[in-house]
Amino acid sequence: LQDLCSNCPAGTFCDNNRSQICSPCPPNSFSSAGGQRTCDICRQCKGVFKTRKECSSTSNAECDCISGYHCLGAECSMCEQDCKQGQELTKKGCKDCCFGTFNDQKRGICRPWTNCSLDGKSVLVNGTKERDVVCGPSPADLSPGASSATPPAPAREPGHSPQ
């Protein structure tokens, strides 16, 4: 016996209450594939969620987060509060990064500054709560008479453009 329900198109459901008619999905529901015996309830983007794409009879709604929040998880399943750069979100809210750590985004955690000395380099620019340190040449590279990997550019005479 052929299962007629399997032929009901997306946007409908095979309604057993109504003798297997391929009935359009009721309001606020959808079926993204054919052969469905029920329509799925549309996701509602409420509270900290806002609608990015409306629900249709064949596809679910898609949500974003309202201003001041960002998406987490598959299909934006959660919204997490934004913090400022130089902060991280804790159970008690946004807290400044501890000394020696930084966060250059509105989300995520504070990460330790790069330890330049581990690579045998020196600190060229100090780190802040918002920015990592910038490592420069090793102290040995900066000593007088040290050979440079790239020769210095020739000095130009004033008033002359390069050839």
């Epitope: 007629l4 032929n7 009901c8 198109p9 946007g11 409908t12 209450n17 109504r18 003798s19 297997q20 008619i21 391929c22 009935s23 359009p24 999905c25 009721p26 309001p27 029920t38 329509c39």
Partner: antibody, heavy 118, light 112 residues
Framework: QVQLVQSGAEVKKPGASVKVSCKAS????????MHWVRQAPGQRLEWMGW????????KYSQEFQDRITISRDTSASTVYMELSSLRSEDMAVYYC???????????WGQGTMVTVSS | DIVMTQSPLSLPVTPGEPASISCRSS???????????LNWYLQKPGQSPQLLIY???IRASGVPDRFSGSESGTDFTLKISRVEAEDVGVYYC?????????FGQGTKLEIK
């Protein structure tokens, strides 16, 4: 726009058959079920049967079960309703109607008058 | 078969006044999805019927908000908050849940 256009009026003798067509346009024909409803002069509307346009399976009211055939031609986006062994009580306006929302017939044809007279 | 009983059968109304039509079903029209499968149609003189309300209380596309449907068990009501001249015709309730789908006998709304 979405519409259903039915074939013209028919005059039939008792015992004969009539076949009414309903051509759909402006939407995906195979997505929506099609129903047939009739209305005898001065009477209430009477549901006759439906066809799952995309699949072709049908369900009929018991009252017409032995005399009605609903068929469809998907390539022509057309549904047909054939009623046999006509009698005088079958004189009515016959409507096709699309089930466009859950259980609701949102688009109706203009109706086809079928007269049964000897 | 599910019997649909409408009242009144005739309803004279003054334009701008409200109107109410009742429909009672002999059995529950509650679908397993939680909706009552009850429709309201208006058939204007010389025209095909048009869908007003489906699933008991949801206005069909393009239907003015002066039309509303309510439900209580097997009792259903169509309300028109302010009747306009264009609302004249015969109003039918219908159940599309159990075969054979059945209509009420109709309520003829006319302007006083």
């Amino acid at each position: 726009q979405v519409q259903l256009v039915q074939s013209g009026a028919e005059v039939k003798k008792p015992g004969a058959s009539v076949k009414v067509s309903c051509k759909a346009s402006g939407y995906t024909f195979t997505t929506y079920p099609m129903h047939w409803v009739r209305q005898a002069p001065g009477q209430r509307l009477e549901w006759m049967g439906w066809s799952n346009a995309g699949i072709g399976n049908t369900k009929y009211s018991q009252e017409f079960q032995d005399r009605i055939t609903i068929s469809r031609d998907t390539s022509a986006s057309t549904v047909y309703m054939e009623l046999s062994s006509l009698r005088s009580e079958d004189m009515a306006v016959y409507y096709c109607a699309r089930e466009g929302v859950a259980g609701g017939f949102d688009i109706w044809g203009q109706g086809t008058m079928v007269t049964v007279s000897s | 078969d599910i019997v649909m009983t409408q009242s009144p059968l005739s309803l004279p109304v003054t334009p701008g006044e409200p109107a109410s039509i009742s429909c009672r079903s002999s059995q529950s029209l509650l679908h397993s999805n939680g909706y009552n499968y009850l429709n309201w149609y208006l058939q204007k003189p010389g025209q095909s019927p048009q869908l007003l309300i489906y699933l008991g209380s949801i206005r069909a596309s393009g239907v003015p908000d002066r039309f509303s449907g309510s439900e209580s068990g097997t009792d259903f009501t169509l309300k028109i908050s302010r009747v306009e001249a264009e609302d004249v015709g015969v109003y039918y309730c219908m159940q599309p849940l159990q075969i054979p789908y059945t209509f009420g006998q109709g309520t003829k709304l006319e302007i006083k």
